[in-house]
Interface confidence: medium
Amino acid sequence: EDELQVIQPEKSVSVAAGESATLRCAMTSLIPVGPIMWFRGAGAGRELIYNQKEGHFPRVTTVSELTKRNNLDFSISISNITPADAGTYYCVKFRKGSPDDVEFKSGAGTELSVRAKPS
């Protein structure tokens, strides 16, 4: 069986300030079991943007119903974009663990750039 791949098809996305940004992410398999998370940046200093399992992310909505059986689409939309949102976003699959989930595989990243709002 092929190992799961995390696919972020867009290398970059450009959005005008005030608009919503859609960041696409898809998995190639349902296995292993475990949540996905979105981060801005990589390494130790990365910032958690969305956690499928828990959290409060009012500006983030999922494009598809993540709890739906056999769902492989983990794209998100971030509303009301500001310049502070610019950066590279990574979709990361975690493997269910005890007590903590373990990072399994990351997408290649999508760079979000923010344009000035047209006057």
Partner: antibody, heavy 119, light 108 residues
Framework: DVQLVESGGGVVRPGESLRLSCAAS????????MNWVRQAPGEGLEWVSR????????DYADSVKGRFTISRDNSKNTLYLQMNSLRAEDTAVYYC????????????WGLGAPVTVSS | ETVLTQSPATLSVSPGERATLSCRAS??????LAWHQQKPGQAPRLLIY???NRATGIPDRFSGSGSGTDFTLTISSLQTEDSAVYYC??????????FGGGTKVEIK
Amino acid sequence: DVQLVESGGGVVRPGESLRLSCAASGFSFRSYAMNWVRQAPGEGLEWVSRIDSGGGGTDYADSVKGRFTISRDNSKNTLYLQMNSLRAEDTAVYYCAKQYDWNSFFDYWGLGAPVTVSS
Amino acid sequence: ETVLTQSPATLSVSPGERATLSCRASQTVGSKLAWHQQKPGQAPRLLIYDASNRATGIPDRFSGSGSGTDFTLTISSLQTEDSAVYYCQQYYYWPPYRFGGGTKVEIK
């Protein structure tokens, strides 16, 4: 009810260290970014540092960069600020503040912990 | 870095009258502006977020308006308990999060 209670403030000499704590209750601490904001005697509010909900992403004001370290223990619902190489100009009341979203306003504030740096 | 300038520095208003506070940003901050109230010896408290939305439990005599670079906090009928310093805060560009210098509202 959301409660943020700071502790660990006190009087120290220049060059010494101090560690502030902020005990959080009344909300899902692990789901929110947290901040430290300070207020020097008779002055306005100055943002000091921020940490994202997972603890990976941190930011600092230029005035404290390299001297202060923000951290959190989500299992203890506690936010910390380790302050090293303290200077007279660090004298202030230090407030912890909960952030509504990862890129958003501060919706709840602690009561504050006074820090005095004096020889 | 975005600078927030508040005016006036001090505002003296009689009870029941209207108080109008201004916050001007050095560059656009969209609608990403909050107002906080700080009474003497107390911690700040959120009043308004996203320029015009009242926070939970805030009386409707407080209202916010504006977008881009010019913002206003209005207290429609000043009460004695509204004596405080009011700070604006932007969260459009960060870090750092920036606060204005504050406006002190005194009761005449």
